[in-house]
Interface confidence: low
């Protein structure tokens, strides 16, 4: 009933709660002397379903058979309509349409840790649309049964708040869940288990690692576990890897030796536990332990290259360069590099430790045979030294690689190709391709890059430290014993027309011709490798086409003579620069009048 129903009653048969698809009979009847005031046969009883009229009848009572009610709650209200007055509410009723509960499925119980409590979950099946109460029962030894009720709307989990203990680990317990509502009840299939079946250990904790004598080969992992744990599984991986190494251990008692760890590597370790070989479930993985393994002495050898530069008749500058060892070769933090320079005939040797750099420059006499050895040292020792005899890398013309070319290969790559030298190609032991940014004046501080190529290769793709719109000086060396030959070329990965033309800084007169001098275009404005300069000139006030002179680009050149100017005529001169992509805009304009005598 939804109000006091003073004027009449609404009755529902067979029940206010019905099965989906059932029919109900609803009766609305007026109490004595509650009809219309003047003439009771004018009573008009109207039945509403929510706000919609579904039936009416003149008299003291109304009967209505209702079918097809939807799942959920439907409100029926009976009203009285008298002539010349508003409808008066008599009474009402709610009808609840639902279904009997389905059998709960997949009942499973778990106890998290030896000190945890038993909790069970199940699948309810389809919604009953009615108030449904779930009762969970657990029957165990000594004829004891625990039971707990759940009155949530959607109940599919209950924690008993009881703790199963391992006194009799083989004792059976049986769980069952029963769902009850007004239309029926249904019970799950019973689930029978022992302590060992349902206890899921807590993950191990307090994980530590120890390295005996600071050695990666003598490593022990320690952890703490719950008392009944029989099995453990360990997983570990380098922190930068996605793949785990797995180890299963029995009766480990909280320790295990690991034999295959790499030195100077940060690892992540996790452990899981289980109480029984084939019963129960594995714990969650423990929290990760992250630890770095100790260093070991470096393996591998440094890749060393060098440059020679003539200083004067008696001295030469040697610049040594080397590449960092890979992480797996360094096996620790490289503290310094040891460079030894030795004159082979006289036996004089000089050793120096280099920190923070992968290059070293020194000045040595041009006479004598010199060799260098370079090794890398960490806290545990040094790598094997790389030994190189210093020679004139380009001395043997017959060893010079032929037809060297450099072509752009996609973004920031240059493909260098060559033909073997004319001298017996089988004599070549290896090729070295070297590249550095082209800087006018041959700045020795510009970083040097190189790669080694097998003697049967005739191409190399260079991509390291290659930037767009920068010109690189590329050399290909062919090495054979103590001899070397080289060829060079300029190349870029991407080019466009230079952003500016050369700046003419001086024009001087020499014996009836002029010498034009200019400043190089800044490297960042060259936009690739320059191929030519052009010098333009025309008479000052003339509209005629300018004349021009095209000069092949050479790194060191910054002046050029012109001898086709007429004396005592004022000319305007300017310059441009060209790459393979096109011509720059004009540089500055200069006026000049040749003073020499006319022919």
């Amino acid at each position: 009933k939804i109000d006091a129903c003073k004027r009449g009653d609404v009755t529902v048969k067979p029940s206010h709660v019905i099965l989906l698809g059932s029919t109900v009979n609803i009766t609305c009847s007026l109490k004595p002397r509650q009809g219309c005031f003047h003439y009771s046969r004018r009573n008009k009883l109207i039945l509403y379903k929510f706000d919609r009229r579904i039936n009416f009848h003149h008299g003291h009572s109304l009967n209505s058979q209702v079918t097809g009610l939807p799942l959920g709650t439907t409100l029926f209200v009976c009203k009285l309509a008298c002539i010349n007055s508003d409808e008066i509410q008599i009474c009402g009723a709610e009808i609840f349409v639902g279904v009997a509960p389905e059998q709960p499925q997949n009942l499973s119980c778990i106890q998290k840790g030896e000190q945890g409590t038993v909790a069970c979950t199940w699948e309810r099946g389809r919604d009953t649309h009615l108030y449904t109460e779930y009762t969970l029962q657990l029957s165990g030894p000594k004829n004891l049964t625990w039971q707990k009720q759940c009155k949530d709307i959607y109940c599919d989990y209950l924690d008993f708040g009881i703790n199963l203990t391992p006194e009799s680990p083989e004792s059976n317990f049986t769980a069952k869940v029963t769902a009850v509502n007004s239309l029926g009840s249904s019970s799950s299939l019973p689930s029978t288990f022992t302590f060992l079946d349902i206890v899921r250990p807590l993950p191990p904790w307090d994980i530590r690692i120890k390295f005996q004598k600071a050695s990666v080969s003598r490593c022990t992992l320690y952890w703490r576990d719950e008392g009944l744990v029989l099995l453990n599984r360990l997983r570990y991986r380098p922190s930068n890897s996605r793949l785990w190494n797995m180890v299963n251990v029995t009766k480990a008692k909280g320790r295990h030796d690991l034999l295959d760890l790499k030195p100077f590597t940060e690892y992540e370790f996790q452990i899981s536990s289980k109480l029984h070989l084939y019963k129960g479930s594995w714990s969650d993985w423990s929290e990760s332990l992250r630890a770095q393994t100790p260093e070991e002495e470096p393996t591998g050898m440094l890749d060393v290259w060098y440059m020679k530069r003539h200083i004067d008749y008696s001295r030469q500058q040697i610049s040594l360069f080397w590449k960092n060892l890979s992480v797996s070769e360094a096996r620790g933090k490289i503290l310094h590099y040891q460079v030894t320079l030795q004159e082979l005939t006289g036996g004089k040797a000089m050793t120096q430790n280099i920190t923070g750099h992968t290059s070293w420059t020194t000045v040595i006499p041009r006479t004598g045979n010199w060799a260098v050895a370079v090794s890398a040292a960490n806290s545990k020792g040094s790598s094997l030294p790389t030994r190189i005899n210093i020679m004139n890398l380009c001395e043997a013309g017959l060893l010079a690689p032929r037809q060297v070319s450099a072509n752009s290969e996609g973004m920031d790559n240059i493909l260098v190709t060559w033909q073997p030298p004319r001298k017996d190609p089988s004599a070549v032991q290896e090729y070295v391709v070297e590249w550095r940014e082209l800087h006018p004046g041959g700045d020795t501080q510009v970083p040097l890059n190189w790669l080694r190529s097998r003697p049967y290769n005739v191409s190399a793709l260079i991509s390291e430290n290659i930037k767009s719109y920068i010109c690189y000086e590329i050399r290909v060396y062919a090495l054979s014993g103590d001899q070397g030959g080289c060829s060079s070329i300029l190349g870029n990965s991407k080019h466009k027309a230079p952003l500016s033309g050369p700046h003419i800084n001086a024009i001087t007169e020499e014996k009836g011709s002029i010498l034009i001098s200019w400043n190089s275009i800044p490297v960042q404005e060259q936009m690739g490798c320059l191929l030519h300069y052009r010098i333009y000139w025309k008479e000052r006030d003339s509209n005629s086409q300018p004349q021009l002179c095209e000069i092949p680009y050479r790194v060191s050149q910054n002046s050029h003579p012109i001898n086709s100017l007429q004396p005592r005529v004022t000319y305007v001169l300017w310059m441009t620069a060209l790459t393979a992509a096109g011509e720059s805009s004009h540089g500055n304009e200069r006026e000049f009048c040749l003073q020499g005598k006319a022919n």
Epitope: D152, I153, Y154, D156, Y157
Partner: nanobody, 123 residues
Framework: QVQLQESGGGLVQAGGSLSLSCAAS????????MGWYRQAPGKQRELVAA???????IYHDSVKGRFTISRDNADSTVWLQMNSLKPDDTAVYYC?????????????????WGKGTQVTVSS
Amino acid sequence: QVQLQESGGGLVQAGGSLSLSCAASGSAFRLNFMGWYRQAPGKQRELVAAINSGGTEIYHDSVKGRFTISRDNADSTVWLQMNSLKPDDTAVYYCAADRGISWSKLAGGMDYWGKGTQVTVSS
């Protein structure tokens, strides 16, 4: 102990809007879920919308697209913006909160409840 105080209920015409607000006080700093339930006369209490501290939102199908729940974790406050209201939305609206995260809690068994605020939508 956590106290929940609702405000913002009232009478509104169908198609109109209302905004409900609920502020938690007491030991509210560890509340995970905060949400709104409603109970119309003679009906079971039903979840309308809920939100957890990570910003996950849950809505009853009947209000999806019309109601928006939002939350200020720092102030332990939750709001329910109700647009395009219908007469079916008439009910007492309860604010509820819980430190746990289980679905059954969400569905009706939350630990903390407000006293409720009446929302009436007239046609």
